[in-house]
Interface confidence: medium
Amino acid sequence: TNINECASNPCLNQGTCIDDVAGYKCNCLLPYTGATCEVVLAPCAPSPCRNGGECRQSEDYESFSCVCPTGWQGQTCEVDINECVLSPCRHGASCQNTHGGYRCHCQAGYSGRNCETDIDDCRPNPCHNGGSCTDGINTAFCDCLPGFRGTFCEEDINECASDPCRNGANCTDCVDSYTCTCPAGFSGIHCENNTPDCTESSCFNGGTCVDGINSFTCLCPPGFTGSYCQHDVNECDSQPCLHGGTCQDGCGSYRCTCPQGYTGPNCQNLVHWCDSSPCKNGGKCWQTHTQYRCECPSGWTGLYCDVPSVSCEVAAQRQGVDVARLCQHGGLCVDAGNTHHCRCQAGYTGSYCEDLVDECSPSPCQNGATCTDYLGGYSCKCVAGYHGVNCSEEIDECLSHPCQNGGTCLDLPNTYKCSCPRGTQGVHCEINVDDCNPPVDPVSRSPKCFNNGTCVDQVGGYSCTCPPGFVGERCEGDVNECLSNPCDARGTQNCVQRVNDFHCECRAGHTGRRCESVINGCKGKPCKNGGTCAVASNTARGFICKCPAGFEGATCENDARTCGSLRCLNGGTCISGPRSPTCLCLGPFTGPECQFPASSPCLGGNPCYNQGTCEPTSESPFYRCLCPAKFNGLLCH
């Protein structure tokens, strides 16, 4: 009889039991499996997803997939995405890939995660003197108010602001005049003239000279070239030979000698070594840029797979030669592992030293030199004007500095020429023309030097030696002698500029050309009536008299007891007294000289706050407050 094994309900977790002969089978509900549905399928426990990835199990609970956070990828989010590939960083910033993200290293002047924000360089405002600011990239531009200039409007424009000097000349302010310091190539009081730079010897071989600013250019006739038309056209000047090819100039043409690995009229193409099938015996040719190598099948070796993988002795036997003669031209056969190779004498190459090395191919000799090949080397026979192993160095005939007076020496093959500056002549620019004659400029009808300046001839021009007090290219500027601060600062009230001179106006109590001396005011005994004299350089007279009782005045000249020195105002009457005179005032006035109204606020109670002292005055409001330290204002409040 068949026992029903399902009777004992062996299938766990609601699995369905199917009775079988001598056994049973469980059909399990997901996510359970196993013989009795006892195993739980949980591909996400523990989670295989890394770097914060979210694990999602498949519908059949057999597999999982990871939902990766930003910046990660891969089956288990194990691969860091290189966000830098997408070039998120703006404005030239460099991108740095980080774990799960990226960081932008901004260029100066930018900020933000992707360096998208232009930093406001106008905060705080860098512009001085009311200048308005415009933000730039890592900089600020200041628009200055009239009267100011400089990057940040920090410079007050001087008296040369009318810009009288032309062509970029520097202006120096003088008294009622100015001088212009001209840049190279310009002359004239305002630097308005472009100094002519062309001379008869400027351009060679019929070249036309075109004047520039402190320079010239030569327009060359056909067949000539160079800054001075000094060279025959050299088709090699345009450097037509690429990749280090050597250019050989011809008549209206050129020829390129290419380095190994390049070919074509301009050495522009790589040589396809493999096209010539250099690999023998079934070897495969593999090229890498200008080189190639042969991958040999088993049994063969050597550069071209032409050397059998046998010893020197076996190879010699196969070729029917003595081992000593297996390698040609005195080469030495050496066993190496299961093969052999030849060590060739200098000047020979090839697997068996069968090929003669041609050191003249490609020709190393330059500038039309002749190459002679010999065993293991070569020699170059140079044409006139060149030297060096490869005739690459031109003999510089200018080394002896043959051109005088600032002439430019032009080295040519086997010779030289001098391009002379304005005002010079001769093959070597040895003649200096006298530019001081005539002394009056024929165009402007003005003297070459103003204000009795002396003309000094120079190469291609002249200079003026100015008399004292004058400056400028032509002594046109009157020097402000006060600018050098010649007067003593302590003793001088004011400096007055004069023609080639200055005058110091001294403060009271000072004297001397520069007001450098203090006057001894007591020297002439100015104090009268027994008064004592004291030197006081800060007073108008340079002295102070201390008067005895009963005398007063700057020199104690007044008898204080008489009415001689006293003035009684507002109709007051003077009365002489035993010690000093006094004023008898009319009704509405009071004070030592009857100068105050009798109704002065100081008399009817102190109007000043904070212990201020009330002092009567003769004008409305007829008082003022003398305030203690820390207080001020009309009433010291």
């Epitope: 990749h243 390049y262 396809h272 493999c274 495969k284 593999w286 090229q287 840029h289 991958e295």
Partner: antibody
Framework: QVQLVQSGADVKKPGASVKISCKAS????????MHWVRQAPGQGLEWMGI????????SYAQKFQGRVTMTSDTSASTVSMELSSLRSEDTAVYYC????????????WGRGTMVTVSS | QAVLTQPSSVSGAPGQRITISCTGT?????????VEWYQHLPGTAPKLLIY???NRPSGVPDRFSASKSGTSASLVITGLQAEDEADYYC????????????FGGGTKLTVL
């Protein structure tokens, strides 16, 4: 005549691998290099790598290094290309093509194999 | 992103002459590597059009010509025909990428 016959189209799930074969006929198999080039939908041609059929020497584009394997069977005149850890962006037509030297033009191309990577 | 730069599209009327440029750098075209050109019609394998800068394989009409200069190359099609409508790719090699094969991004030619 000279031809390169590729295996048929394939559909794969992300993370899986795909292997495409390319059988050469009409010429000496070991005399030419074999390359693999792919073209994703709406994109341009992209070189994957080269194999020397004689000795199995390979050189892969940086982008595919670690994921691509090219092999050669000289007896069957066949080269194969296997790409692992597939992702949706690997959906493309994959071509085999030959060149005489490793620096030469691709004169003969296979008809291409469409590989679709989809979950 | 393609290492060699091509215009994404060009167009011309039948009989006209069009030029497709291919610009590289000193590490690829400028280093002396040859430039190849391919024609790719939809649903077919690419076809070799020009090899080694300027040579036409047998069977390619002489309406197709190409040249290379410095770091760039160009393909010229004269007497444009309707069957020329296709994608065109230039190809070279690059030393910086270990002598890897590099392609241009492709140029879609439309015959109006």
């Amino acid at each position: 005549q000279v031809q390169l016959v590729q295996s048929g189209a394939d559909v794969k799930k992300p993370g899986a691998s795909v292997k495409i074969s390319c059988k050469a006929s009409g010429y000496t198999f070991t005399k030419y290099y074999m390359h693999w080039v792919r073209q994703a939908p709406g994109q341009g041609l992209e070189w994957m790598g080269i194999i020397n059929p004689t000795n199995g020497y390979t050189s892969y584009a940086q982008k595919f290094q670690g994921r691509v394997t090219m092999t050669s069977d000289t007896s069957a005149s066949t080269v194969s290309m296997e790409l692992s850890s597939l992702r949706s962006e690997d959906t493309a037509v994959y071509y085999c093509t030959r060149s005489y030297s490793n620096y030469d033009s691709f004169d003969i191309w296979g008809r291409g194999t469409m590989v679709t990577v989809s979950s | 992103q393609a290492v060699l730069t091509q215009p994404s599209s060009v167009s011309g009327a039948p009989g006209q002459r069009i030029t497709i440029s291919c610009t590289g750098t000193s590490s690829n075209i400028g280093a002396g590597y040859d430039v190849e050109w391919y024609q790719h019609l939809p649903g077919t394998a690419p076809k070799l059009l020009i090899y080694r800068n300027s040579n036409r394989p047998s069977g390619v009409p002489d309406r197709f010509s190409a040249s290379k200069s410095g770091t760039s190359a160009s393909l010229v099609i004269t007497g444009l025909q309707a069957e020329d409508e296709a994608d065109y790719y230039c190809q070279s090699y690059d030393t910086r990428l270990s002598d890897s094969v590099i392609f241009g991004g492709g140029t879609k030619l439309t015959v109006l």
